[in-house]
């Protein structure tokens, strides 16, 4: 694609390159034969984050508590407010816009990577030899018990969902 | 004082081609955009495309991409649109004019009569 | 692409009247209105850019408002070089369109 008539930073207006208004201002009014492009600094709690040519400045996002948000970054007159969710709960989509309890492995699934603020607990089924047997959004699957160690013999096998039962061994008469 | 003047009229056949040249004179070349239009015979004007001389960047109206070639040189101060594959319905006055605050000084025209 | 509609497409006036002549845009064009004056194998004159701005050399007679889509050109006082070929062109969005022209004639 070849250049345009104007450069880079650039805008074309009745037939004449203006300068564009940087990160955290707005047009005023275009630059003119005689004139240079008039911008001013976004207000408080507003902000524009690429070279433009905007007549008003973006609002700064909301962390809503009542949707569970939090500020995690404050923003300034060149970015937006990056917001999270509060302990325990995650965000539903990319722009963080409500959020959601983290999700809990149920009994015979354990927590394959724990939920941050943007994303939700990733459960696995327990394989042979682990079982959990809590709903849980922590827990990871446990192994069952070594009755050998412990000079024990196994009364009743393990599941997913359950430890095995360890006994004594039988005495020989 | 600001002077566009164009080169003379041009009588082409069907499916050739013609460039027209626009040779500015009394302001920096290459400080304003360089604008084309065409008026067909008892008609109103259609902008075809600008170019910036200071580098060669160019805008089309998206009627003439492919027909109309924007080009300048600086070291004569002179712009130039070329026009291929012309047909009868081609056949119009083609202005330059200066940018500006609007098409600021105009060309005297060229009338390009395309006739087999 | 921007639609300039212009009226009337002709009116024929005597010198001295008062000449308005309206452009209307299909979208907010933001102030970016041109005025030109057409005559008969003459190079096209710019006589207003950006509303209101009177072009350098332009007489004063010419004076052009408006906003938003509705723009006017007034000619205070008509002259006898004023008769002639007059179109408006917004400069705001590309492709750059004209209206099709007022032809102002001689009553």
């Known amino acids: 694609e070849p250049p345009t008539a104007c450069r880079e930073k650039q805008y074309l207006i009745n037939s004449q390159c203006c300068s564009l208004c940087q990160p955290g201002q707005k047009l005023v009014s275009d630059c003119t034969e005689f004139t240079e492009t008039e911008c001013l600094p976004c207000g408080e709690s507003e902000f524009l984050d690429t070279w433009n040519r905007e007549t008003h400045c973006h609002q700064h996002k909301y962390c809503d508590p009542n949707l569970g948000l939090r500020v995690q970054q404050k923003g300034t007159s060149e970015t937006d407010t990056i917001c999270t969710c509060e302990e325990g709960w995650h965000c539903t989509s990319e722009a963080c816009e409500s959020c959601v309890l983290h999700r809990s492995c149920s009994p015979g699934f354990g927590v394959k990577q724990i939920a941050t603020g943007v994303s939700d607990t990733i459960c696995e089924p327990c394989p042979v030899g682990f079982f959990s047997n809590v709903s849980s959004a922590f827990e990871k699957c446990h192994p069952w018990t070594s009755c050998e160690t412990k000079d024990l013999v196994v009364q009743q096998a393990g599941t997913n969902k359950t430890d095995v039962v360890c006994g004594p061994q039988d005495r020989l008469r | 004082e600001v002077q566009l003047v164009q080169s003379g009229a041009e009588v082409k056949k069907p499916g050739e081609s013609v460039k027209i040249s626009c040779k500015a004179s009394?302001?920096?070349?290459?400080?304003?955009?360089i604008e084309w239009v065409r008026q067909m015979p008892g008609k109103g004007l259609e902008w075809i495309g600008v170019?910036?001389?200071?580098?060669?960047?160019?805008n089309y109206n998206e009627k003439f991409k492919g027909q109309a070639t924007l080009s300048a040189d600086k070291s004569i101060s002179t712009a130039y649109l070329q026009l291929s594959s012309l047909k009868a319905s081609d056949t119009a006055v083609y202005f330059c004019?200066?940018?500006?605050?609007?098409?600021?000084?105009w060309g005297q025209g060229t009338l390009v009569t395309v006739s087999s | 692409d921007i639609q300039m509609t212009q009226s009337p497409s002709s009116l024929s006036a005597s010198v001295g009247d008062r000449v308005t002549i309206t452009c209307r845009a299909s979208q907010d064009i933001s102030n970016h209105l041109n005025w030109y004056q057409q005559k008969p194998g003459k190079a096209v004159k710019l006589l207003i850019s950006s509303t209101s701005r009177l072009h350098s050399g332009v007489p004063s007679r010419f004076s052009g408002s408006g906003s938003g889509t509705d723009y006017t050109l007034t000619i205070s006082s008509l002259q006898p070089e004023d008769f002639a070929t007059y179109f408006c062109?917004?400069?705001?969005?590309?492709?750059?369109?004209f209206g099709q022209g007022t032809k102002v004639e001689i009553k």
């Open positions: 004019a200066r940018g500006g605050s609007g098409f600021a000084f």
């Open positions: 170019i910036n001389p200071g580098y060669g960047g160019v």
């Open positions: 009394g302001y920096g070349f290459t400080n304003y955009l």
């Open positions: 062109q917004q400069g705001n969005t590309l492709p750059w369109t």
